[in-house]
Amino acid sequence: TPEVWVQVRMEATELSSFTIRCGFLGSGSISLVTVSWGGPNGAGGTTLAVLHPERGIRQWAPARQARWETQSSISLILEGSGASSPCANTTFCCKFASFPEGSWEACGSLPPSSDPGLSAPPTPAPILRAD
């Protein structure tokens, strides 16, 4: 069964800057990745970035840089300043669509009492939804 992993890390240099990394553990090719915060996309969450393998990347503040790391993983850096900046208990969700298999979404947040610059290993997060 395909799985999605989510890793959230607070940058040591900028304490209010976050890096989110997400990956898809499955055999299908990825057709779309959507990163959101505040809950799953379409269920109260707010879209931060959309990554399409052919048409490119779109991102919304406070997202600063979204990029493909591999064909099945992405990373997103969030700006740390301003009213819309994330806080330590913010939930981030990644939804991977794999055509024609379907889509899988998982969420994660900063590990409790984690030191800046440290993070939990990118183990699979609980799968919230598989369409």
Epitope: S31, L32, T47, V50, H52, E54, R55, G56, R58, Q59, W60, F99, P100
Partner: antibody, heavy 117, light 107 residues
């Protein structure tokens, strides 16, 4: 109500310039990709250009270097600056919305551009 | 560039007929395809998105199917207001490309 209203079309001589505008209302403009699509008289639809929410631009090969798409999110406005116009650019130009990357869903009524001497 | 070959270019049909229009992509586009209806002097209107999902407010007699390179728009029972020109659009990669159109005329 979601609405797109184009303006700026008209008659222009070959080699001339024209700037099309599109006023958007009824939705959060900055969240959407915006496109220009044209239709020559009696012909089919042809995609011209796309601009992403943060200003990423994409063009049809035949207009690259001549046309420039831009947007002003604060004014809910989309533009198409057309230079070095040719007779083959004569068409109705439509402003179109897309919730990236799910395809164009809302179209304006179009504005007519005629390139002729 | 991805070419979209639409067929037929025109067809004559009667009210109540079942009508099928096909689009073939020159390479795989997954389900990144929409179908549009255009009436003379009017802007196009989206009927189908993601190859098979019905746009809100569009009558259920319209349906879409297919994925990869072969796509079909079906009108199960043609109504007088359905006489128009239909286009497919691939939005999988740039440049976005439309099919050549199918004009549905009254027999």
């Amino acid at each position: 109500e979601v609405q797109l209203v184009e303006s700026g079309g008209g008659l222009v001589q070959p080699g001339g310039s024209l700037r099309l505008s599109c006023a958007a209302s009824g939705f959060t403009f900055r969240n959407y990709d915006m496109h220009w699509v044209r239709q020559a008289p009696g012909k089919g639809l042809e995609w011209v250009s796309d601009i992403g929410n943060s200003g990423e631009t994409y063009y049809l090969g035949s207009v690259k270097g001549r046309f420039t798409i831009s947007r002003e999110n604060a004014k809910n406005s989309l533009y198409l600056q057309m230079n070095s116009l040719r007779a083959g650019d004569t068409a109705v130009y439509y402003c179109v919305r897309e919730e990236f990357p799910h395809g164009m869903d809302v179209w304006g009524q179009g504005t007519t551009v005629t390139v002729s001497s | 560039d991805i070419q979209m070959t639409q067929s037929p270019s025109s067809l004559s049909a009667s009210v109540g007929d079942r009508v099928t229009i096909t689009c073939r992509a020159s390479q795989g586009i997954r389900n990144d395809l929409g179908w549009y209806q255009q009436k003379p002097g009017k802007a196009p209107k989206r009927l189908i998105y993601a190859a098979s999902s019905l746009q809100s407010g569009v009558p259920s007699r319209f349906s879409g199917s297919g994925s990869g390179t072969e796509f079909t728009l079906t009108i199960s029972s043609l109504q007088p207001e359905d006489f128009a020109t239909y286009y497919c659009l691939q939005h999988n990669s740039y440049p976005l490309t439309f099919g050549g159109g199918t004009k549905v005329e009254i027999k």
